[in-house]
């Protein structure tokens, strides 16, 4: 019968011929009366056999990631009679893995959006690298993820590639972050190969800023001939938030005379001071009113940022009109 062990050949061997093992018949007594032959895909080009001894050699550099096993057939013939000594047999040569592939991130580019002020531990995104090496062969394809750029705001779980927030971020200070993740095979041991990817993390706005008046004091004038409903001037607050979170409402906080009103122009986000009652220069020619401004939409959990509304004082001077 045939005698052989399992055949393995390491990939990427640079030698011109590499001895893999020996195929022989147990009828072979070593007097060179038998001839061994190799048949099948790769026979003669990738693998050769010593016809006398049955020793098999790889004569080409192999790449496991291209082809991980070869199925060949062996024959043994009695040279004197030309007849088969053993029935033709099929055998396998397995290409064994070496760590010749670095981890690759296949889903690039990565981009994620996360609300500003999210608590520590909030999941941002999961990045995944793949390694073409053999996952069943040692640690060649066992990956560890680490953060090359992004501290102290982000962290990555070493085995899963899950990126989490590790420190609260304020969109109004910085609205996007580039995080660089490295994946290393060999679980980071010597000889490891690595690959990197960039993740763009954008912060979405939350209503963590209240509107604040641009000026703490305004001066307006109104003619005593102005009819009720007249717009006598505008006041303006700014809000570092954006979109809906920056929409505001102006109102009167203090006007003992009940002479003025404030309406909000929701397009410009300005407050328009309106004359509610006609004024009379001879009766009163100086007014002082206090206005306040608040956001239009404030979720309950963000009320802590909006405890005290910003206020401004408006001095209104009445201009005299000569009466007939």
């Amino acid at each position: 019968g045939w005698v052989w062990n399992q055949f393995f050949v390491p990939e990427e061997m640079n030698t011109t011929s590499h001895h893999i093992g020996q195929l022989r018949s147990d009828l072979d007594n070593g007097n060179n009366s038998f001839q061994y032959k190799l048949l099948g895909a790769g026979a003669g080009s990738t693998f050769i056999i010593d016809e006398r001894t049955g020793d098999i050699y790889a004569i080409q550099k192999l790449d496991r990631e291209e082809r991980s096993l070869y199925i060949l057939r062996a024959q043994v013939i009695d040279i004197a009679t030309g007849r088969a000594v053993e029935p033709e047999s099929e055998f396998v040569i397995k290409v064994s893995d070496i760590n010749d592939n670095e981890p690759k991130f296949l889903d690039e580019p990565y981009e994620a959006i996360v609300p500003e002020m999210s608590p520590e531990g909030t999941l941002v995104i999961q990045v995944t690298a793949s390694d073409a090496d053999d996952p069943s062969s040692g640690n060649n394809a066992r990956l560890l993820y680490s953060l090359l750029q992004g501290q102290p705001y982000f962290s990555v779980e070493p085995t899963t590639g899950v990126i989490r927030i590790s420190s609260k971020m304020d969109r109004e200070l910085q609205d996007e972050y580039w995080v660089i993740i490295q994946a290393k095979d060999m679980i980071g041991q010597p000889g490891a190969l690595s690959g990197t990817t960039s993740v763009l993390i954008k912060l979405s706005d939350v209503n963590d800023n209240k509107p604040i008046f641009k000026e703490s004091l305004y001066r307006l004038t109104v003619s005593e001939s102005a009819p009720t409903g007249t717009s006598i001037g505008t006041i303006m607050a700014y809000d570092n938030d954006i979109g809906e979170n920056a929409e505001m409402d102006y109102s009167i906080e203090e006007d003992d005379s009940q002479t003025f009103d404030i309406i909000t122009n929701h397009e410009t986000q300005e407050g328009i001071v309106i004359l509610k009652k006609k004024v009379d220069f001879e009766h009163q020619n100086h007014y002082g009113i206090r206005a306040k401004v608040k956001n239009h939409h404030v979720p309950e959990q963000l009320m802590k940022y909006h405890t005290e509304a910003s206020t401004t004082f408006i001095k209104i001077q009445v201009e005299d009109v000569d009466e007939p």
């Epitope: 305004y218 100086h286 002082g288 001095k315």
Partner: antibody, heavy 120, light 107 residues
Framework: QVQLQESGPGLVKPSETLSLTCTVS??????????WSWIRQPPGKGLEWIGY???????YYNPSLKSRVTISVDTSKNQFSLKLSSVTAADTAVYYC????????????WGQGTLVTVSS | EIVLTQSPGTLSLSPGERATLSCRAS???????LAWYQQKPGQAPRLLIY???SRATGIPDRFSGSGSGTDFTLTISRLEPEDFTVYYC????????FGPGTKVDIK
């Protein structure tokens, strides 16, 4: 802290024009919303408001003095000035410059005052 | 114009006593438009109270203001030696007018 300092002649002849200047330091005269006033106090008597000016040049005067008063402003020098024409002995007083408040038309900051005597 | 009348003209009290100074307007004014000043001899007036009950910066809490309509009051809860001087009320709704003053002197 805003500081105000009056300057000008201490003696003016009757029928002449009294001229005083107030120099503002520790703040800009062009600050939005603030009015700059002149107030006077005859010796041993009460206070009388003369008029005010806004940094844009808009002025408003006490109706009883309106015909004789001019208040002007020089934002480049951070100063405002008072001119009171056709003075009489009744105009002898300590003259104060003042700035109104951030929450109303009251007088929050005052100069230390300068005595102007009208006498021949 | 609005005329302000202050009473009494002179108030004689001892240190530690309570002083109540009155200011009456010739017609109704909004309480937001009244202020009180203190003036010591040879000095400029100093703002005490505005609007009519807000204390100006640095003013001790023994000074308080109240009132509405035509009647306003400045109260000094416990007179200190430095409080014996002249006090003026001022309205700033219709032009600007001052009261004639109340002198607080030591009894």
């Amino acid at each position: 802290q805003v500081q105000l300092q009056e300057s000008g002649p201490g003696l003016v002849k009757p029928s002449e024009t009294l001229s005083l200047t107030c120099t503002v330091s520790g703040g800009s005269i062009s600050s939005s919303g603030y009015y700059w006033s002149w107030i006077r106090q005859p010796p041993g008597k009460g206070l009388e408001w003369i008029g005010y000016i806004y940094y844009t040049g808009s002025a408003y005067y006490n109706p009883s003095l309106k015909s004789r008063v001019t208040i002007s402003v020089d934002t480049s020098k951070n100063q405002f000035s008072l001119k009171l024409s056709s003075v009489t002995a009744a105009d002898t007083a300590v003259y104060y410059c003042a700035r109104d408040g951030s929450s109303g038309w009251y007088f929050q900051y005052w100069g230390q005052g300068t005595l102007v005597t009208v006498s021949s | 114009e609005i005329v302000l009348t202050q009473s009494p003209g002179t108030l004689s009290l001892s240190p530690g006593e309570r002083a109540t100074l009155s200011c009456r307007a010739s017609r109704q004014i909004s309480s937001s438009y009244l202020a009180w000043y203190q003036q010591k001899p040879g000095q400029a007036p100093r703002l005490l109270i505005y609007g009519p009950s807000s204390r100006a910066t640095g003013i001790p809490d023994r000074f308080s203001g109240s009132g509405s309509g035509t009647d306003f009051t400045l109260t000094i809860s416990r007179l200190e030696p430095e409080d014996f001087t002249v006090y003026y009320c001022q309205q700033y709704g219709s032009s600007f007018t001052f009261g004639p003053g109340t002198k607080v002197d030591i009894k």
